[in-house]
Every structure is written in C-alpha cells, then in structure tokens.
C-alpha cells in the first residue's frame, strides 16, 4: 500500500520529502531501483538503479535540484531533498522503491503532496481617489505571494468587513510564478473614511493589513497576523 | 509523458507461438524496469514477466520455461516471446514500467487468444 503524506515549503527554500523503511533496515544498492516521480505528469525527479552512476534521464526541471544520499539509501532512507523550491513544485511525488533480488517486489511506495508558501509583500494602499463627486476609490495591491490570496477590505472604525461586491480585484501570475494582487475598492463619499486592506494567506495562516484614512496619506502601521482562530471567528481576532 | 505502443497480439491455436511488441516514445525507457502484464476477463491483472535495465528477468510460475522477456535499450523496446501458448493464456497482454504500475497507469494493451 502506498502510503501519503504532506510537507510545506516557502519557496526558495530546501525541502525533504520523506521516503524511509523502518529503522535498522539494510539494502543493497546493487540490489535496489527507486525511483521519485510526479504523481500527475509521471516526470522522473531522480532515481537510482544498480550499476549506474548517470542521472541524464532526470527531468531538466529537477537535474542538479533533487538529490537522494547514498549513505541514506544503504539504511533505507530514500527520502528526497528538493532545493530551491519553485511553485511549480507544488505537486504530488512519488517514491518507489523494488528489489531485483525479490522479484522486483514493491519495498516502500510513498505518495507526498507538497505544498508551496510564499508571503505576499506588505500591502500598498493609494490615497483616496475621487473620480466623481459622491465616490472614493482606494487601491491596494500586494506582490511576490503564494498561494492565490483572499483580499479583504476592513471598516477600521468598527472591524466589520466591507461588501466584497464594491471590491474589484486584479490577481496575476508574475514570471516567477508567484501572484500579484490589485483591489480596487469604490464606497461611497463619506466625511470621514477609516478603511484597511487585508491580504490573506490561507496556506500560511498570515494577514497582512494595512489602513488608509481620508485626509491622510501614510497608511496606518502595518499589521502582520499569523495563526488567526478559526475562519468563523476571523473578523473579530485579526483585524482588531 | 511516457507512450508505451503494445503489438503482436492475435489469434493462435494451443501449442502455437507469439511475439509481442512494445515500443516506449519516453525517454527513460533505459532506466526503466518493464514488465508485461495480462488481464483476462473477469479476472485481475496479472504481472507476467518483468526484466530490470540490466536485462535481468523475473517470470510468474504460470509461464516459467514457455515465456520469454527481453528489451532493446537501443530502441526502446520490450518483447515477450510466447511459446506453447495454452488455452488460458487467452487475455488482453499491457507493457508497461514498474514505476508507472505503481501510479495506475495503463496503455491499450493487445488481445491474445488461444483457440483449442
């Protein structure tokens, strides 16, 4: 049986992916062929097959970016360390491990889905924008994130949350594959206006906040939340 | 995303021979462990024969001594020689690589069928 698990990694960092026989296992390297693959698209990752030291059949995607230990390997630990994690790695992987000597029988099928994390960039908010008499319009945008973000507009005066339907937002995959974000929100013309833009992060359990008042040009101090209670409770703990 | 092409089936009398066929587009058929498997109906899916990069063979006990697995690197291809086919040989025969076995995943396969 194949087992599953799941590890989460900030890109640009170095991950292990777990693939291990219990402890006090001994193999064989001429004996063994393991192989890590992605689940979905079948592309080799790395591998190791008796009598041969060559990786040119690793993807060009993973070469010099997924390595298993040797020494590891000998007592049974096959696990996988990806550097430089990239969200295009955000994927299921698979490690399979047989042995010639027994038929090449399945030893160790290991399934691991890997999560990717980037923080988004402090939000930006504009200073109010008046494109008619009676409208504010404020933009806030926020960079360099991972996964798609949740974009919240705050009543600051009282921490209720806006109507999502006077926000327009923006979301766009940059070249690093990575999201940018752009809301614009557009209320209505009131004598005083103390709003906040929350970016959220649902991966990383992080809200990034920031405020804007009328008559006001520097934004309030930035607020950074992480681990806020459950989503029912959300309003009321993370945007105090 | 590896191809594997499976031919040579079809339909032969008891005693009679076959050779099948299966040609990998992949590029990482030298690495590849192959197997030939086989599915009769109303039956599972069975592991026939597996030869690892090195040309070493593994056989099910059903085919011992009649069956024979061997692969080209060169041409990224695996065979398996059938010989003194019997009558419940008769199934649909896959190739595939171990490590694609493990995710589920399957070609067309071939039809054989052995007439008494």
């Known amino acids: 049986d194949t087992q599953e698990k799941e590890v989460r990694a900030m890109v640009g960092s170095d991950v292990e992916l777990s693939c291990a026989c219990p402890e006090g296992s001994r193999f064989d390297l001429n004996d063994v062929y393991v192989y890590w693959q992605t689940s979905e698209s079948k592309t080799v990752v790395t591998y190791h097959i008796p009598q041969n030291s060559s990786l040119e059949n690793v993807d060009s995607r993973y070469r010099n970016r997924a390595l298993m230990s040797p020494a590891g390997m000998l007592r049974g630990d096959f696990s996988l360390r990806l550097f430089n994690v990239t969200p295009q790695d955000e994927q299921k992987f698979h490690c399979l491990v047989l042995s010639q000597s027994l038929g090449f029988q399945e030893v160790l099928s290991v399934e691991v889905t890997l999560h990717v994390a980037a923080n988004f960039s402090v939000p930006v908010v504009s200073a109010p924008h008046s494109p008619s008499q009676d409208e504010l319009t404020f933009t806030c945008t926020s960079i360099n994130g991972y996964p798609r973000p949740n974009v919240y507009w705050i009543n600051k005066t009282d921490n209720s949350l806006l109507d999502q339907a006077l926000q327009n937002d923006t979301v766009f995959l940059n070249m690093r594959g990575l999201y940018d974000v752009v809301s614009v929100l557009r209320i209505a013309r009131t004598p005083s206006v103390n709003i906040g833009c929350c970016i959220e992060n649902v991966l990383l359990q992080q809200n990034l906040t920031v405020g804007s008042q009328t008559g006001n040009d520097i934004g309030e101090r930035d607020k950074i939340t992480e681990n806020p209670v459950s989503t029912g409770e959300k309003n009321a703990a993370t945007w105090s | 995303e590896v191809q594997l092409v499976e031919s040579g089936g079809g339909l032969v009398q008891a005693g009679g021979s076959l050779r099948l066929s299966c040609a990998s587009s992949?590029?990482?058929?030298?690495?590849?462990?192959m197997g030939w498997y086989r599915q009769a109906p109303g039956k599972v899916r069975e592991r026939v024969a597996i030869i690892g990069t090195g040309g070493f063979p593994v056989y099910a006990d059903s085919v011992k001594g009649r069956f024979t697995i061997s692969r080209d690197n060169a041409k990224n291809t695996v065979y398996l020689q059938m010989n003194s086919l019997k009558p419940e040989d008769t199934a649909v025969y896959y190739c595939?690589?171990?490590?694609?076995?493990?995710?589920?995943?399957w070609g067309q396969g071939t039809q054989v069928t052995v007439s008494s």
């Open positions: 595939n690589a171990a490590r694609l076995v493990a995710l589920g995943s």
């Open positions: 992949g590029s990482t058929f030298s690495i590849d462990v």
